[in-house]
């Protein structure tokens, strides 16, 4: 029922206003102008984005499960936002914990050699039967973001005349016959079809793909960043280890592929104020327009400190713009002096290729512990994971609409294959909510000083962070 407010007495209007003020505490606000779609609705719940007809409807909405859940999340968010700034001792303790973890959980040069030897051995085995193929190590082993137990990612480069599925079937047969490998199986239904086996000597799991060029390019990019930016590798290792502790890094179980965590760290370092990493494309490129960023394709790493790009004007955006321009020209009076914006842009984009630096000129002075905390805060409070896309190519924040990707869960753009959301394996809302909740718990845990025996906490123990960052020492500060 809609009340005719003009007929209310002053006392009744006071009562209504009082009720509305109370509703505001629950994030339900009176609409100044009614929405054309919801003409009967007088109120809007800003938390749940729901239109509500009247006060009674608002009281009913407040009791709903989703509203209560959103209220709790909002309360937790404001609690997290009001956490005190960490002391320098706290940050120093965090820095030590991250460095120790990187040493303890990351792979050493010896571990890397073992992994390279595995590829060498496998090359010999496979090339005996397929001499035109070559094998290369890629993924976390090469970037040095691998944890000691991480799989060994191997890709087979093969000539165009060979058939991809047939090749993998042959590889499956070859490895099955070899005494060097056990538990040889195929996983041809995976997003990237692979042959999986265990190296008998090292007991490491190997995942053998074929023609996985994009993954190799991403590997090269991340490996180069690890070499030029000292904080990158320890941050990625800490982030990956945290994800492993929380069981959110298993792609097959609906989690996030492990290299996504490296892209997330990279994106954070680009977006923080001031940034510690540059974006890969930007206004330093003559004729660059963020609206037409897909005309610029990343092509790989050069000199270990630049990313190569190419301008390709035959992309879909160009065709659309030309079509629009032609339509506009047809509607215009003839005028030879007039140049459309598209003409200018086409001329401006003179540079057909170039390279972008992977580092900023100013050296980083930010303590590692502070960056770890900022990273958790960024994904807990500052960056709306459901709304935007994690895109390391440009400084502008991309919305889901920009990419035509649905508005939910996590979207991470593959910098070398821009139509791919590399986090699409996280496809359950429940898992997404668990990931968000883990971020909150982690930020709370690391933002609050921890005592040696562990803090007495009123938090639900099941919700507490599973294990501390370093298995040697708990984070401690004065």
């Amino acid at each position: 029922t809609v009340i005719d407010e003009s007929a209310l007495t002053p006392e009744q209007r006071l009562g209504l206003k009082q009720a509305e003020e109370r509703l505001e505490r629950d994030h339900i606000f009176r609409l100044e102008k009614r929405s054309p779609e919801y003409t009967n609705c007088r109120y809007l719940c800003k938390l749940c984005l729901i239109h509500i007809e009247n006060i009674q409807g608002a009281h009913k909405h407040i009791k709903e499960k989703r509203h209560k859940k959103n209220i709790l999340e909002k309360q937790e968010e404001s609690e997290l936002r009001s956490l005190p700034s960490p002391s320098s001792a706290h940050l120093a303790a965090l820095s030590v914990a991250v460095v120790e973890l990187a040493k303890e959980q990351g792979i050493t040069d010896d571990d890397l050699r073992i992994r390279q030897d595995i590829v060498e051995e496998m090359s010999k085995v496979i090339m005996t039967f397929l001499p035109e193929c070559s094998l290369r190590l890629y993924g976390s082993s090469l970037t040095k973001f691998a944890l000691k137990s991480s799989d060994v990612n191997i890709d087979i480069k093969f000539p165009p005349k060979m058939n991809h599925p047939d090749l993998l079937i042959q590889v499956l047969g070859i490895l099955k016959k070899s005494a060097l490998y056990i538990d040889v199986e195929s996983d041809f239904h995976a997003k990237v079809p692979v042959v999986v086996c265990k190296d008998r000597k090292s007991a490491l799991l190997c995942r053998v793909s074929a023609g996985n060029d994009m993954a190799c390019l991403t590997t090269d990019l991340l490996a180069a960043l690890g070499k030029v930016e000292p904080v990158f590798t320890p941050l990625v290792l800490a982030f990956r280890y945290w994800a492993k502790l929380c069981y959110i890094d298993s792609q097959t179980d609906g989690g996030i592929p492990s290299y996504c965590f490296a892209l997330m760290v990279m994106f954070f370092l680009q977006q923080r104020k001031p940034p510690l990493l540059p974006c890969l494309l930007g206004s330093w490129i003559e004729g660059f327009d963020p609206k037409r960023m897909d005309d610029f394709q990343l092509k790989g790493i050069v000199e270990e400190k630049f990313v190569k790009w190419e301008y390709n004007s035959s992309s879909a955006t160009e065709k659309n713009l030309i079509a629009d321009e032609n339509k506009a020209k047809a509607d215009e009076p003839k005028d030879d002096t007039k140049k459309t914006e598209t003409d200018n842009q086409s001329n401006a984009a003179k540079a057909k290729h170039g390279k972008s630096p992977l580092t900023l000129e100013a050296p980083n002075q930010v303590p590692l512990g502070q960056l770890w905390l900022e990273l958790l805060k960024f994904y807990t409070l500052d960056f709306a994971l459901e709304e935007y896309v994690i895109c390391v190519r440009i400084q502008d924040i991309l919305t889901r609409e920009n990419k035509n990707w649905p508005k939910r869960r996590i979207a991470i753009e593959d910098p070398f294959s821009v139509k791919r959301n590399v986090a699409r394996s996280l496809n359950s809302q429940l898992v997404y909510e668990y990931v968000v909740e883990r971020f909150r718990a982690a930020y709370r845990y690391f933002a609050c000083p921890q005592k040696k025996g562990g803090n007495k906490s009123t938090m639900d123990p099941k919700k507490k962070e599973k294990g501390k960052l370093s298995s040697k020492k708990p984070v401690k500060s004065d």
Partner: nanobody, 118 residues
Framework: QVQLQESGGGLVQAGGSLRLSCAAS????????MGWYRQAPGKEREFVAG???????YYADSVKGRFTISRDNAKNTVYLQMNSLKPEDTAVYYC????????????WGQGTQVTVSS
């Protein structure tokens, strides 16, 4: 338990002014409305003025332009400034506070007498 203590009432000549105060003690929650009512002998209690926690004010037509309600949230106190008083304003003035949200006002003071002589 909430106690409301009114003060400032008295005898005043027509055209004069008075300022009533009402201090609330006990558990007063944010978002409580506070108001003033009055009851003249042989008449029903009537609404005079009210103010929400956010500061929105409402007046009975008979007092609009002459009375001003205000509040000090820090002190949990509500005031009623009464100017250009008329003999028909003579009544016992009651302070009221809203806590439960079910009734508009659910706690009432003892009242303070205001007499306007002609």
């Amino acid at each position: 338990q909430v106690q409301l203590q009114e003060s400032g009432g008295g005898l005043v000549q027509a055209g004069g002014s008075l300022r009533l105060s009402c201090a609330a003690s006990g558990t007063i929650f944010q978002s409580t409305a506070m108001g003033w009512y009055r009851q003249a002998p042989g008449k029903e209690r009537e609404f005079v003025a009210g103010i929400t926690f956010g500061g929105s004010t409402y007046y009975a037509d008979s007092v609009k332009g002459r009375f001003t309600i205000s509040r000090d949230n820090a002190k949990n106190t509500v005031y009623l400034q009464m100017n250009s008083l008329k003999p028909e304003d003579t009544a016992v003035y009651y302070c009221a506070v809203s806590l439960s949200g079910v009734e508009l006002f659910d706690y009432w003071g003892q009242g303070t007498q205001v007499t306007v002589s002609s």
